[in-house]
Every structure is written in structure tokens, then in C-alpha cells.
């Protein structure tokens, strides 16, 4: 019976594994997330490439439907907390001094998302765990 | 409320370029990632491009990829979609989509018919 | 590969209850999906997530009526008392981000003919 938990446990872990993607990868697209920051590495994105705006654009919150997250265990809407996330070390051109200030930024970035364990990915509420191996690399780079 | 409003569609030449434009109202248009998505004559959903709130990350699939460009201008509200080396099978309707916390494609517009032909 | 497979068509009755189902690809049976309705000559229209657990979050405007279900790998849209406005397709998507690649993909759409 206690392996049967186990192993019951395990999926049910393992069951949402692609929501949590889904909801990590919205958020990004929303608050531009430097995903790239989280992988140490330098490879291009297979199907993602930086646009070519250069405008630096402050990320702002509509009302309509933010603060919305459906649970997975229930269907009632949950609170979804947003604090209006910087993005990250943004590699904009000027303002060389800022340099210091985009490293702390990255570093703080780059514990929100890793293959052990999704801890801080400014899904605040969102009590989100994840021990697959599969978790979001995108490596998209931005100018 | 929510309005997209895709224009310049049109009928074009294998091999030769045309740029879609999306109009959009009723939200804060900086705020949210917008992807376009096409539909054949007859034919299912494809998604063919997607574009973070800034625009700073773009994503396109195999079928489109350097190809197919996805820009915006979040001073005039406008997403773009230059398509280049354009080909009969990129004959489809073009609808331009908008996100948000929840879901990829929330809000949807018209859509605005590309014909490739000779 | 991520593939989402629908019945080309099904028929109800006015006022009637009609279940539209969405198969995933078997190793893809946990995925939260997407449902939308698409009316002849109109662009899609978002409807619902639809989660592994049969959870679901409706979008703007959209009816009660409306509901989703899961059981394994099928993805089920419910709609009851069903209305002469609700003859359309209906087709799921998923999307997925997976070894540094977004994808997002369609089912072929089943089209509901309200008798």
C-alpha cells in the first residue's frame, strides 16, 4: 500500500509538469523574463530569435484579467500576486554604469527556474514545484 | 473591450513579400504577448508566430521560421507580420491573437485573407 | 510529437447535451489544453483551459453551459441546452515549451451541427 502512495504521489507531482511550463512560459511573455539567464549557456534558441525593436518598453499590468490563476487541484480562481517584474539585465544599448545594478538582477533571475526546482519565478501564490528534467530552457537571446 | 483588427492582406506572387498589420484596442497593448495564426481555405489552425510584450523574444515554428518575421510598435499599438519568400501553401486567412495570464490565444481578431498565387 | 485528434463531426439536438471529445498523443495525456469555437465565417473564439484533472477556466463572455472534463488522455467539451448559435467547430490546441522550443499546435476541429 505504501509504494502504491508512493508511486501515486509521483504522478500526481509529475501530472502538471506541463502546465507549469505553460504558466512559467505566459508569464514570460508577459514580463519578458530572461529565460536565457537561467541556462549558462550561449546557444542560440532553435525557433526563438531577439526582435528587432530596440525600444526599452516598461513592462505594465492591464486590469482585464490579471490576477487570475486557476489551481490545479480546484476550480476556483486564486489570486494570482504580481509584482511588476524588471526585466532582467536587459542588453540594451547606452547606460553602461548600470552594468552592476543588471548583474544583481540576473542573479536573482537566474534562481527562478532551474531543472531541480522552480522556486521564485515571481509566481507568487502559485506554490510551484517541479523535479522533472524537462523544465522551460528557452534560450532566447535578446540584443 | 478587446478589438484586433488585422489588414493588409491581399493576393501576391510565390516568391514576393507582404506585410499583415494588426490593429489594437480596448487593453494596454505593451502589456501582453500577441502571436499570429493562420487558417487554410477548408483547412485547421496554425500557429504561426509569437512575440513577448516588449518584443524582445520571438518564436515561429519550423514551417515559417526565416521566413516569416513577427515585430510591433507599442507606440502605435500594431503587430506586424512581414513574410517573406512567400509560397501557395501560405494561401490562408491570418488572424492576429492576443494573451493573457491564463491562456495563449484569448482574443482573436477578423482575420485578413493572404492568397499566394501566380 | 504532440497531436491532438478530434472527430470530424457530431450532431445534437436543440436544447440537447452534446460531449465533443480531444485525444492527446498518449505521452502527452497529462497536458492542460485549450478549447475554442470557431462560427462559419467568424474568427476562433477562446472558450476554456482544460486541465489534466478537469479543472477549467472559461474566458470572457463565455456561458455556463460551457463545461470541460478529463478522463486519461481525452479532453471533453460539454455543452448543454444546446442553442441554434452553437452550431460551429470546435477545436482544441495545447502548447508546450520543451528543449528550448515553443510549439503550439491544433486539432483538426469537429464541426457541430445543432439538428
Known amino acids: 500500500k505504501r509504494a502504491v502512495s508512493e508511486h501515486q504521489l509521483l504522478h500526481d507531482k509529475g501530472k502538471s509538469i506541463q502546465d507549469l511550463r505553460r504558466r512559467f512560459f505566459l508569464h514570460h511573455l508577459i514580463a519578458e523574463i530572461h529565460t536565457a539567464e537561467i541556462r549558462a549557456t550561449s546557444e542560440v534558441s532553435p525557433n526563438s530569435k531577439p526582435s528587432p525593436n530596440t525600444k526599452n518598453h516598461p513592462v505594465r499590468f492591464g486590469s482585464d484579467d490579471e490576477g487570475r490563476y486557476l489551481t490545479q487541484e480546484t476550480n476556483k480562481v486564486e489570486t494570482y500576486k504580481e509584482q511588476p517584474l524588471k526585466t532582467p539585465g536587459k542588453k540594451k544599448k547606452g547606460k553602461p554604469g548600470k552594468r552592476k545594478e543588471q548583474e544583481k538582477k540576473k542573479r536573482r533571475t537566474r534562481s527562478a527556474w532551474l531543472d531541480s526546482g522552480v522556486t521564485g519565478s515571481g509566481l507568487e501564490g502559485d506554490h510551484l514545484s517541479d523535479t522533472s528534467t524537462t523544465s522551460l530552457e528557452l534560450d532566447s537571446r535578446r540584443h | 473591450q478587446v478589438q484586433l483588427v488585422e489588414s493588409g492582406g491581399g493576393v501576391v506572387q510565390p516568391g514576393r513579400s507582404l506585410r499583415l498589420s494588426c490593429a489594437a484596442s480596448?487593453?494596454?497593448?505593451?502589456?501582453?504577448?500577441m502571436s499570429w495564426v493562420r487558417q487554410a481555405p477548408g483547412k485547421g489552425l496554425e500557429w504561426v508566430a509569437t512575440i513577448s510584450s516588449g518584443g524582445s523574444y520571438t518564436y515561429y515554428p519550423d514551417s515559417v521560421k526565416g521566413r516569416f518575421t513577427i515585430s510591433r510598435d507599442n507606440s502605435k499599438n500594431t503587430l506586424y507580420l512581414q513574410m517573406n519568400s512567400l509560397r501557395a501553401e501560405d494561401t490562408a486567412v491570418y488572424y492576429c491573437?492576443?494573451?493573457?495570464?491564463?491562456?495563449?490565444?484569448?482574443?482573436w481578431g477578423q482575420g485578413t485573407l493572404v492568397t499566394v498565387s501566380s | 510529437q504532440l497531436v491532438l485528434t478530434q472527430s470530424p463531426s457530431a450532431s445534437a439536438s436543440l436544447g440537447a447535451s452534446v460531449k465533443l471529445t480531444c485525444t492527446l498523443s498518449?505521452?502527452?495525456?497529462?497536458?492542460?489544453i485549450e478549447w475554442y469555437q470557431q462560427q462559419p465565417e467568424k474568427g476562433p473564439k477562446y472558450l476554456m483551459d482544460?486541465?489534466?484533472?478537469?479543472?477549467?477556466s472559461t474566458g470572457d463572455g463565455i456561458p455556463d453551459r460551457f463545461s470541460g472534463s478529463s478522463s486519461g488522455a481525452e479532453r471533453y467539451l460539454t455543452i448543454s441546452s444546446l442553442q441554434s448559435e452553437d452550431e460551429a467547430d470546435y477545436i482544441c490546441?495545447?502548447?508546450?515549451?520543451?528543449?528550448?522550443?515553443?510549439?503550439?499546435?491544433f486539432g483538426g476541429g469537429t464541426k457541430l451541427t445543432v439538428l
Open positions: 491573437a492576443r494573451q493573457t495570464t491564463m491562456t495563449y490565444f484569448a482574443y
Open positions: 482544460l486541465k489534466q484533472d478537469g479543472s477549467h
Open positions: 490546441g495545447v502548447g508546450d515549451t520543451i528543449k528550448e522550443q515553443f510549439v503550439y499546435v
Open positions: 480596448g487593453f494596454t497593448f505593451s502589456s501582453y504577448g
Open positions: 498518449s505521452q502527452h495525456s497529462t497536458y492542460t
